[in-house]
Interface confidence: low
C-alpha cells in the first residue's frame, strides 16, 4: 500500500513539476526591467527565452519573437536547449510511468517490468528536474553578470558617453517558477525510485528440484535466494551541462533596440 | 508617458544644412527605435529614414540617401535629423517618431517647421 | 517599395453617421514572424498625427472603441461606427511590413 501511495505520489508531483516547467520554458517573464532606481517608469520591458516585450503603463503592450538562431547569444541557446531537454525526458518518464502504476493493470504484466519502469521513469524525472535548475541557473547567472556589468556602466560610461538611464534587467517570474517545477519533478523522480525498490519482488521462490548427479542424490530445497534486480549496472553518470568559462561577447546584453534580430 | 520634445522652427537658404532634434522624456532612447518623418504642406506623410531593429542599424529611404544624417546621443537621450544641400521643396513640418523597438507609430514629436527660401 | 492605396481621398459624412475608409497594399503585409504590421493614424487639423489602430485591428490605448480595424493580406479597413466631431481630419494607413516604411495618401474626412 505505502508503495503505491509512493508510486502515485511521485507520478502526481513529477506531472505538476514538468507542467510547471513547460509553463516556465513558455513565459515571456524571464527576466524584468529593474524598477529599482525608476519606479515610476512609462514603459516595462520584460524577456523570455522566444519573445521579448514592453508594457505601456496604459496597459498597451507589445510582444517581439526572436528571428534568428544564429544571431542569439550561446548561452540563451543553451538555456533553450536545457529546458527542452527537461521537457521532452519529463514527458517520456510521465508516459512509462502511467504504464508502471500499480494501480493499472496492463495485461499479465509482471512486478519487475513496473519495477523496472518505475526506475526508468524516476531516472527520467530526476535528469528532467536537472535540466529545469541547470537551464534556469544558468539564465539566472547571465543576469547577474550583465546586471552587474550595466551597473558599473551606468557610473564609468561607454566610449566616452555617459548613458543616464541604462535599463537593467531582474528576476522575472519565470525563474521562479523554473526553479520550483524542477525540484518538484526530482523529488517526483526520487520518490519514483524509492518506490521501484518496493515494487521488486524480494522474493523469488522455486519449486523442489531433484538433481541426480553420478552415484550422489542432492536435494535442493527452496531458499531465501534475493531477487537480483540487475539495477546496479544502470547507474551512469551523464554529464548535462557544461557551465564553463564564456568570453564576455557571449554574456547576453539586453538592454539595447540593437539586440532584436 | 513618453514624450518627444522636437527643436523648434527653422529657416533656411536653398543649399544649406538643418538639424533638427528630438529630445525623448520618460523613457530611454537607446531601447527606442526612432523615425523621421516630413509632410510638405498641404501633402501627406513620407518616411526619411529610422533604426531597423532587425537588421541593428539605420535605414534611409533612396530618395534622402546621402543628404540625410540620422544620430543619437544617449547621454542627453536625444535623436537628431540632420537634412543638407536644402532645396525650397524641402520645406515642410519634420517629424519624429518612435516605436517601442516594434513596428509601430506609437509616439510622435509636435513637429519642426523647416522653411527652405532664398 | 510597398505601394498603400486609399479610398476614397474624401469622406463627407454627417455626424453619428458610420464612415469606412480602404486601404489596399501592393503586396502581402505578412511578416514573417506571422505578424501583419498594419497601422491607421490620424492627424487632426494643426497636430501631429497620432496611433490608432496598429497590427490591422489593435486599438492602442486612450482609442476610442468607435474606431476599428480589418482586413488580411493586402486589403484593410478603418471603421468609425458614429462619427464624432473630433473625428475631423486626414486618416492614413502605414505599412510596417518591410523598409521602407509607406503610408496612404491619407483620406480626408469632414463633416457635411
Known amino acids: 500500500m505505502a508503495v503505491t501511495a509512493c508510486q502515485g505520489l511521485g507520478f502526481v508531483v513529477s506531472l505538476i513539476g514538468i507542467a510547471g516547467i513547460i509553463a516556465a520554458t513558455c513565459m515571456d517573464q524571464w527576466s524584468t526591467q529593474d524598477l529599482y532606481n525608476n519606479p515610476v517608469t512609462a514603459v516595462f520591458n520584460y524577456q523570455g527565452l522566444w519573445r521579448s516585450c514592453v508594457r505601456e503603463s496604459s496597459g498597451f503592450t507589445e510582444c517581439r519573437g526572436y528571428f534568428t538562431l544564429l544571431g542569439l547569444p550561446a548561452m540563451l541557446q543553451a538555456v533553450r536547449a536545457l529546458m527542452i531537454v527537461g521537457i521532452v525526458l519529463g514527458a517520456i518518464g510521465l508516459l512509462v510511468s502511467i504504464f508502471a502504476l500499480k494501480c493499472i493493470r496492463i495485461g499479465s504484466m509482471e512486478d519487475s517490468a513496473k519495477a523496472n519502469m518505475t526506475l526508468t521513469s524516476g531516472i527520467m524525472f530526476i535528469v528532467s528536474g536537472l535540466c529545469a535548475i541547470a537551464g534556469v541557473s544558468v539564465f539566472a547567472n547571465m543576469l547577474v553578470t550583465n546586471f552587474w556589468m550595466s551597473t558599473a556602466n551606468m557610473y564609468t560610461g561607454m566610449g566616452g558617453m555617459v548613458q543616464t538611464v541604462q535599463t537593467r534587467y531582474t528576476f522575472g517570474a519565470a525563474l521562479f517558477v523554473g526553479w520550483v517545477a524542477g525540484g518538484l519533478t526530482l523529488i517526483g523522480g526520487v520518490m519514483m525510485c524509492i518506490a521501484c525498490r518496493g515494487l521488486a519482488p524480494e522474493e523469488t521462490n522455486y519449486k523442489a528440484v531433484s538433481y541426480h548427479a553420478s552415484g550422489h542424490s542432492v536435494a535442493y530445497k527452496p531458499g531465501g535466494f534475493k531477487a537480483s534486480t540487475g539495477f546496479g549496472s544502470n547507474t551512469k553518470n551523464k554529464k548535462i551541462y557544461d557551465g564553463g568559462a564564456r568570453t564576455e561577447d557571449e554574456v547576453q546584453s539586453y538592454p539595447s533596440k540593437h539586440d532584436y534580430v | 508617458q513618453v514624450q518627444l520634445v522636437q527643436s523648434g522652427a527653422e529657416v533656411k537658404k536653398p543649399g544649406a544644412s538643418v538639424k533638427v532634434s528630438c529630445r525623448v522624456s520618460?523613457?530611454?532612447?537607446?531601447?527606442?527605435?526612432m523615425y523621421w518623418v516630413r509632410q510638405a504642406p498641404g501633402k501627406g506623410l513620407e518616411w526619411m529614414g529610422g533604426f531597423d531593429p532587425e537588421d541593428g542599424k539605420t535605414i534611409y529611404a533612396q530618395k534622402f540617401q546621402g543628404r540625410v544624417t540620422m544620430t543619437e546621443d544617449t547621454s542627453t537621450g536625444t535623436a537628431y535629423m540632420e537634412l543638407s544641400s536644402l532645396r525650397s521643396e524641402d520645406t515642410a513640418i519634420y517629424y519624429c517618431?518612435?516605436?517601442?523597438?516594434?513596428?509601430?507609430?506609437?509616439?510622435w514629436g509636435q513637429g519642426t517647421p523647416v522653411t527652405v527660401s532664398s | 517599395d510597398i505601394v498603400m492605396t486609399q479610398t476614397p481621398l474624401s469622406s463627407p459624412v454627417t455626424l453619428g453617421q458610420p464612415a469606412s475608409i480602404s486601404c489596399r497594399s501592393s503586396q502581402s503585409l505578412v511578416h514573417s514572424d506571422g505578424n501583419t504590421y498594419l497601422s491607421w493614424l490620424q492627424q487632426r487639423p494643426g497636430q501631429p498625427p497620432r496611433l490608432l489602430i496598429y497590427k490591422v485591428s489593435k486599438r492602442f490605448s486612450g482609442v476610442p472603441d468607435r474606431f476599428s480595424g480589418s482586413g488580411a493580406g493586402t486589403d484593410f479597413t478603418l471603421k468609425i461606427s458614429r462619427v464624432e466631431a473630433e473625428d475631423v481630419g486626414v486618416y492614413y494607413c502605414t505599412q510596417g511590413t518591410q523598409f521602407p516604411r509607406t503610408f496612404g495618401q491619407g483620406t480626408k474626412v469632414e463633416i457635411k
Open positions: 520618460g523613457y530611454t532612447l537607446s531601447a527606442l527605435s
Open positions: 517618431a518612435t516605436t517601442l523597438r516594434y513596428f509601430d507609430w506609437n509616439y
